[in-house]
């Protein structure tokens, strides 16, 4: 019974020590994890700093080019988050670019495609109002993405959808047949049909990048 | 005796567990020391890199202000929301709005102010090139933020800064005196002086929002 008590007392001491050690291990484990996390942060910081240092060196090497590159670099970097690229107009869900050169309809279409866009498509009276306002200070014609093969065919947008009849009346060469087809342009707020081979300004359009930042 | 044996056995187990835990603690202590050493090395590396980076920055600060601008702009652009409001054109560091109504110079100035902007200011040949291109499809005149009281006064921008003489030549009514002053407009790429009371389109300009979010 005395032996038993002694053994029980020792057992209690050992259990207490064991618990204490386990607590220490747990604390050290947490500290280790925190230390690991801190190390990872430091490594990340090093990576970031190393990257920044590398960037700075590169920048220094290319200083005489940077004035030229300012525009391009800004365009590239900012396109990620800006709704529209530089020089485009952002309106509601779309970006619009008014061409600065005169080309035939097909060439104008190619120019838009090269910018990952299409020629202007008017879906609503609101779209039409915006475009009419945007070109209000120009007396020039602008090709839009509307064409037809000949007068017996319907007017179609580039995506193949038909023109909604209530949107606008097409004036001009509506009854004409041309080998290159008949294309629509907008000028001073009105839409006209003309031979697609004529050179005119144009309006490119693409979806605005409205993803959440 | 049976109880004693059971207690002895438990004691042996506890002693074994205690020794094992002490061993673990010792191992963790060594790992922690090594980790601390590694962290110190990493911190030293960070300090070195940070110092190097600081040196590079100092070197770069002496370089042309446009090159520094690129760096800053790129940093700012990295995570922007829309650089410009809807219907404005974003170009480099500015937003531009081409008015859709004709007003005299003062009224045009007020319209821009109400949009938290100012009338167009041309700081460089690059700015001039962009504006000339942007209005290439218009034959109309556009007021800019440049005016003077009479021919004996210098041409001043709205912010009070003088016109850089190499930028462009002002044609038209340069020697005229008008009660409302003489204002500058741009038309088909050339800049003209005219009576400020005349109604014309205008171009508003404000800084693009290139701050990081």
């Amino acid at each position: 019974s005395q032996v038993s008590n002694l053994l029980k007392q020792q057992q209690t001491n050992l259990t207490h020590q064991k618990n204490k050690l386990e607590g220490q291990i747990s604390a050290r484990q947490q500290a280790e994890e925190a230390s690991q996390e801190s190390q990872n942060e430091l490594k990340e910081m090093i990576e970031t700093l190393a990257w920044k240092l590398n960037e700075k060196s590169k920048e220094q090497m290319e200083l005489h080019h940077q004035n030229l590159n300012l525009q391009e670099t800004l365009k590239r970097v900012a396109n990620c988050s800006a709704p529209c690229p530089q020089d485009w107009i952002w309106h509601e869900e779309n970006c619009y670019l008014f061409s600065t050169g005169s080309f035939n309809w097909e060439k104008s279409q190619e120019k838009c495609l090269s910018l990952d866009a299409k020629l202007l498509k008017i879906n609503s009276t609101a779209d039409l109002d915006f475009i009419q306002q945007a070109i209000s200070y120009s007396s020039f014609p602008f090709w839009m993405g509307l064409s037809r093969r000949n007068p017996s065919y319907p007017w179609l947008w580039e995506d193949g959808s038909p023109l909604m009849p209530h949107l606008f009346r097409i004036r001009g060469a509506v009854s004409q047949t041309y080998p290159s087809g008949t294309c629509a342009y907008i000028q001073r707020g009105a839409v006209y049909a003309e031979n697609c081979i004529l050179a005119a300004f144009s309006i490119c359009q693409k979806k605005a990048n409205l993803r959440a930042q | 005796s049976q109880v004693s044996n059971l207690l002895k056995q438990q004691q042996t187990n506890l002693t074994h567990q205690k020794n094992k835990l002490e061993g673990q603690i010792s191992a963790r202590q060594q790992a922690e020391e090594a980790s601390q050493e590694s962290q110190n090395e990493l911190k030293e590396m960070i300090e070195t890199l940070a110092w190097k980076l600081n040196e590079k920055s100092k070197e770069q600060m002496e370089l042309h202000h446009q090159n520094l601008n690129l760096q800053e702009t790129l940093k700012r652009v990295a995570n922007c929301s829309a650089p410009c409001p809807q219907d404005w054109i974003w170009h480099e560091e500015n937003c531009y709005l081409f008015s859709t109504g004709s007003f005299n110079w003062e009224k045009s100035q007020e319209k821009c102010l109400s949009l938290d902007a100012k009338l167009l200011k041309i700081n460089s040949t690059a700015d001039l090139d962009f504006i000339q291109q942007a209005i290439s499809y218009s034959s109309f005149p556009f007021w800019m933020g440049l005016s003077r009281r009479n021919p004996s006064y210098p041409w001043l921008w709205e912010d009070g800064s003088p016109l850089m003489p190499h930028l462009f030549r002002i044609r038209g009514a340069v020697s005229q005196t008008y009660p409302s002053g003489t204002c500058a407009y741009i038309q088909r790429g050339a800049v003209y002086a005219e009576n400020c009371i005349l109604a014309a389109f205008s171009i508003c300009q404000k800084k693009a929002n290139l701050r990081a979010q």
Partner: antibody
Framework: QVQLLESGGGLVQPGGSLRLSCAAS????????LHWVRQAPGKGLEWVSV????????YYADSVKGRFTISRDNSKNTLYLQMNSLRAEDTAVYYC????????????WGQGTLVTVSS | QSVLTQPPSVSGAPGQRVTISCSGS????????VSWYQQLPGTAPKLLIH???HRPSGVPDRFSGSKSGTSASLAITGLQAEDEADYYC???????????FGGGTKLTVLG
């Protein structure tokens, strides 16, 4: 019915100016492109200029470029040709002609007005 | 010197068939439609054929137009005395961005 009536022709000295007009009636003026075509005495037809419905497309023959200006006033149903720095070789009957498309055929013609450039 | 080339003159007896040729290039006749005009002495030209082969209302079916490559032609069958006139072909030249006429062909009805 469709009518095109030219006026403004006459005798003018070399280097002088003249403004021709063409008054239109019997059709929706702004739905048609309009041309000036001339014919020197005893010669063939020579195209001079064309203007589209709202004046967005304007083209000239090389022989008159920089000297002649075509314009239209849709509110007055009138086409104009401002002729400056006139030369002896500009002497001709000037016709205005209507076209349903800028690059298509001339389906109606005026009776013409004679311009004589001589000293 | 006209951009489009026509023979200066053709002739035929009443009731005969005559053709007037009009030669151009790939930038005009080759890629665009051709129109033909008749000009009676002392009058303004009158549209005879448009879109290469279409006759406006009121033009007799004795007149027909056709095109092959960079050349076009006007055929008149059952020639009549009142057909005696000058005939002009016309097209649009997309390279020079202008209307081009032929030099004109004088048709004489013999007898």
């Amino acid at each position: 019915q469709v009518q095109l009536l030219e006026s403004g022709g006459g005798l003018v000295q070399p280097g002088g100016s003249l403004r021709l007009s063409c008054a239109a009636s019997g059709f929706t003026f702004s739905d048609y492109a309009l041309h000036w075509v001339r014919q020197a005495p005893g010669k063939g037809l020579e195209w001079v200029s064309v203007i589209s419905y709202q004046g967005g497309f304007i083209y000239y023959a090389d022989s008159v470029k920089g000297r002649f200006t075509i314009s239209r006033d849709n509110s007055k149903n009138t086409l104009y040709l401002q002729m400056n720095s006139l030369r002896a070789e500009d002497t001709a009957v000037y016709y205005c002609a209507r076209s349903p498309g800028l690059t298509s055929y001339h389906d109606s013609w005026g009776q013409g007005t004679l311009v004589t450039v001589s000293s | 010197q006209s951009v489009l080339t026509q023979p200066p003159s053709v002739s035929g007896a009443p009731g005969q068939r005559v053709t007037i040729s009009c030669s151009g290039s790939s930038s005009n006749i080759g890629s665009n439609y051709v129109s033909w005009y008749q000009q009676l002495p002392g009058t303004a030209p009158k549209l005879l054929i448009h879109s290469t082969s279409h006759r406006p209302s009121g033009v007799p079916d004795r007149f027909s137009g056709s095109k092959s490559g960079t050349s076009a032609s006007l055929a008149i069958t059952g020639l009549q005395a009142e057909d005696e006139a000058d005939y002009y072909c016309q097209s649009w030249d997309y390279e020079s961005e202008r209307v081009v006429f032929g030099g004109g062909t004088k048709l004489t009805v013999l007898g």
